[in-house]
């Protein structure tokens, strides 16, 4: 059986300060059941970048409409990039659990580097 794969096609993305960065992520299956989230960094200290269900992420928009049915595209765009946004971003599939969802599979990561704003 083909297990779900998390595909982050770009290993790295370079964006000028002040511009928007698009971080691409796709799944190969809708199962197992559970949400998808984006993080910067790995391990216990990672920073949550986007979770559709909870939280407020004013600089993040989803590439696909949130009412799209059976969506397999979980790419995001982060606006007004600053040097502080540099780092490696991971698209992570969670498996529904009780009471807490459990990490199931992560993408390989996309390293975001920030260029100086053109003068």
């Amino acid at each position: 059986e083909d297990e779900l794969q998390v595909i982050q096609p770009e290993k790295s993305v370079s964006v000028a300060a002040g511009e928007s960065a698009t971080l691409r992520c796709a799944m190969t299956s809708l199962i197992p059941v559970g949400p998808i989230m984006w993080f910067r960094g790995a391990g216990a200290g990672r920073e949550l970048i986007y979770n559709q269900k909870e939280g407020h992420f004013p600089r993040v928009t989803t590439v696909s409409e949130l009412t799209k049915r059976n969506n397999l595209d979980f790419s995001i765009s982060i606006s007004n990039i600053t040097p502080a946004d540099a780092g490696t971003y991971y698209c992570v599939k969670f498996r529904k659990g009780s009471p807490d969802d459990v990490e199931f599979k992560s993408g390989a990561g996309t390293e975001l580097s920030v260029r100086a704003k053109p003068s």
Partner: antibody
Framework: EVQLVESGGGVVQPGGSLRLSCAAS????????VSWVRQAPGKGLEWVST??????YYADSVKGRFTISRDNSKNTLYLQMNSLRAEDTAVYYC???????????????WGQGTLVTVSS | EIVLTQSPATLSVSPGERVTLSCRAS??????IAWYQQKPGQAPRLLIY???SRDTGIPARFSGSGSGTDFTLTISSLQSEDFGVYYC??????????FGGGTKVEIK
């Protein structure tokens, strides 16, 4: 065209067992979650169970008695029902899950249902 | 468990009338509500998902609205084929998926 066809219903005594099947066609069965929803005579809808890949979820009322499974090579969903009770009497519907956004499931296609009657 | 309360339980309506069905959740479910129609002897049919998105092939006279805890299904001009029972379902927090008790729309 999406089709879900249930079978296996019938009359069974309390404490007995029954296995329901749902044959699916018209969609990529292996990448979708699928569920069982039941409806007692003259009553409303009650969710019973959902299966994703090998992840399974059950209503408290059937936990430990019912087992959901799937065979992706046959595009078929199953519900093994043991220790049946009178209150399990219902039409059992197989339903294809649909997701919206990044999380959240509802049921976009339903079979016509199979009647399970638990009676002595 | 999130409880969905539908009102009224029964609605007697004449064809051509506007119909408003209510579904109230016991806690915030954001916009994670679906609506189904069920006719006697038939399986439920999806009408609306994400509170306000019509399923493919559903006539424009059906519309959904609301977010948080209060949701409405509106049929702008009831047709004879619209009679039946309507159920709301939440998928914000599960298991279990929960359904409302249903609203029966019958001919006046």
């Amino acid at each position: 065209e999406v089709q879900l066809v249930e079978s296996g219903g019938g009359v069974v005594q309390p404490g007995g067992s029954l296995r329901l099947s749902c044959a699916a066609s018209g969609f990529s069965f292996s990448i979708y979650a699928v569920s069982w929803v039941r409806q007692a005579p003259g009553k409303g809808l009650e969710w019973v169970s959902t299966i994703g890949a090998d992840d399974t979820y059950y209503a408290d009322s059937v936990k430990g008695r019912f087992t959901i499974s799937r065979d992706n090579s046959k595009n078929t969903l199953y519900l093994q029902m043991n220790s049946l009770r009178a209150e399990d009497t219902a039409v059992y519907y197989c339903a294809k899950d649909s997701t919206v956004g990044w999380s959240g499931d509802f049921f976009d296609y339903w079979g016509q249902g199979t009647l399970v009657t638990v009676s002595s | 468990e999130i409880v969905l309360t539908q009102s009224p339980a029964t609605l007697s309506v004449s064809p051509g009338e506007r119909v408003t069905l209510s579904c109230r959740a016991s806690q915030n479910v954001r916009s994670d509500i679906a609506w189904y129609q069920q006719k006697p002897g038939q399986a439920p049919r999806l009408l609306i998902y994400a509170a306000s998105s019509r399923d493919t092939g559903i006539p424009a006279r059906f519309s959904g609205s609301g977010s948080g805890t209060d949701f409405t299904l509106t049929i702008s001009s009831l047709q004879s084929e619209d009679f039946g029972v309507y159920y709301c379902q939440q998928y914000y927090d599960w298991p279990p998926f929960t359904f409302g008790g249903g609203t029966k729309v019958e001919i006046k």
